[in-house]
């Protein structure tokens, strides 16, 4: 289930240009903005998706408290540099030669500097906390039903193995989905938790990245689960390095 042969499209990434010019006349798809060939049987990396997005025309608590090293993507969109495999390069710079280091999901993890800034390695984000608030419902969702549906969603829609969904917490109206994936746990072919989280984030905003597949229709025992806000926290294997100035 790579690129769909019949009409030569990429089921997992609508931000591609596809043509039957692959080996043996097979459908091959390339990401907009970068021209990198993508595997349409799995999720496209967040780096290539952000690059494509920038190239497109403009138009009693059971809940987890993120620790002090948790990062939130406050910087918004930027046009990233991706390596040949589609991963974020550790150092990102803008057109005015301002540079910063990012983690594996492309979120800034240092203060901004100049072209002399060094980012020795791409630090892996190994724990992602997706914090959702759902619209009011007549009654709270059953926690175990909600847990089951969200795990199934991540497996079937985003192809993320259930072992990487560490927990689903619920305290009406807040839902928290914890994704965990250490470097040692991630095998070849496994979807990255960062990519799954990004696809999910776009889905809940009504901006599905899937081609031809319907938008996200999440139901728990037939009751629609409608998300009204999303906040995503990222925890890296090595804590971020910000100056005290930013923390005050």
């Amino acid at each position: 289930h790579t690129a769909a042969q019949d009409n030569c499209t990429c089921p997992t990434n609508k931000m591609t240009v596809c043509s039957p010019d692959g080996p043996g006349g097979r459908c091959q798809c390339r990401a907009l903005g970068s021209g990198v060939a993508v595997d349409c049987s799995t999720l496209t990396s967040k780096c290539l998706l952000l690059k494509a997005r920038m190239s497109a025309p403009k138009n009693a608590r059971t809940l987890v408290r993120p620790n002090e090293h948790a990062l939130v993507d406050n910087d918004g969109l930027y046009d990233p540099d991706c390596d040949p495999e589609g991963r974020f390069k550790a150092r990102q710079c803008n057109q005015t030669s301002v540079c910063w280091c990012v983690n594996s999901v492309g979120v800034r993890r240092t203060d901004k500097g100049d072209l002399s800034l060094r980012c020795d390695e791409l630090v892996r984000t190994h724990h992602i906390l997706i914090d959702l608030r759902h619209r009011p419902t007549a009654s709270a969702f059953n926690h175990s039903d909600l847990d089951a549906e969200l795990r199934r969603l991540f497996r079937e829609r985003y192809r993320l193995h259930p072992k990487f969904v560490a927990a689903v917490h619920y305290e009406q109206p807040t839902i928290q989905i914890e994704l965990r994936q250490n470097t040692s746990q991630k095998a070849a072919g496994d979807v990255d938790i960062g990519d799954a989280a990004y696809y999910f984030e776009r889905d809940v905003k009504g901006e599905s990245l899937f081609q031809g597949r319907g938008g996200l229709d999440l139901r728990v025992r037939g009751e629609p689960l409608q998300v009204e806000r999303t906040l995503i926290y990222y925890l890296d294997e090595i804590p971020p390095k910000f100056s005290m100035k930013r923390l005050t």
Partner: antibody, heavy 118, light 109 residues
């Protein structure tokens, strides 16, 4: 790597029965385990599934309520069945997915026969 | 996601070819498997992802299709191919009655 079902029996209508699936040679936590049944001379019928990591269970619409699946030890999964009728007479198989995120069943037990009759 | 398999039974001579079709009620994105089952045995995975051969399966077995329409073709039939074949959608287990097609009995003359 192998699976083996046990617990099949001749039971009366209305009875309950628990089947056990014993796994050998692999770590259950990396897989989903599914139960499938086959009535004599009929086709395969999916009953339900458990994601071992997380323990969440899923059932065919006709099986919801009367069937339950659980992981009972590091190597065993059970299928509990209640209010059995003659229509539940079948060979019951447990099967393992291939460790991907699809539900391809690449390892099956030999099956255990359940007969519901008065 | 109902799976409709045709025909229910097919007969062909040794060395011949049989074709089995499977139709899904909705797009299953090529997440389709084919199984072979012989009497008294559990099913055996033959093909996954609509066209990829499982380990040890001879290349006489060929799967094809996409969207909602899928086909299993067995060429150069051998006596040992006499069995019942089932398709299975491996895309979702949400709100469904069955993941399997009804089965096709292959008789080799």
């Amino acid at each position: 790597q192998s699976l083996e079902e046990s617990g099949g029996d001749l039971v009366q209508p209305g009875a309950s029965l628990t089947l056990t699936c014993k796994a050998s040679g692999f770590d259950l936590n990396n897989y989903a385990m599914l139960w499938v049944r086959q009535a004599p001379g009929k086709g395969l019928e999916w009953i339900g599934c458990i994601y071992i990591s997380g323990g969440t269970t899923y059932f065919a619409s006709w099986a919801t309520g009367r069937f339950a699946i659980s992981k009972t030890s590091s190597t065993t999964v059970t299928l509990q069945m209640t209010s059995l009728t003659a229509a539940d007479t079948a060979t019951y198989f447990c099967a393992r997915d291939d460790g991907s995120t699809s539900y391809y069943l690449n390892l099956w037990g030999p099956g255990t026969l359940v007969t519901v009759s008065s | 996601y109902d799976m409709t398999q045709t025909p229910a039974s097919v007969s062909a001579a040794v060395g011949g070819t049989v074709t089995i079709k499977c139709q899904a009620s909705e797009d299953i994105y090529s997440l389709l498997a084919w199984y072979q089952q012989k009497p008294g045995q559990p099913p055996k995975l033959l093909i996954y992802d609509a066209s990829d051969l499982a380990s040890g399966v001879p290349s006489r077995f060929k799967g094809s299709g996409s969207g909602t329409e899928y086909t299993l073709t067995i060429s150069a039939l051998e006596c040992d191919d006499a069995a019942t074949y089932y398709c299975q959608q491996a895309y979702t287990i949400g709100n469904i009655d069955n993941t399997f097609g009804g089965g096709t009995e292959v008789v080799v003359k």
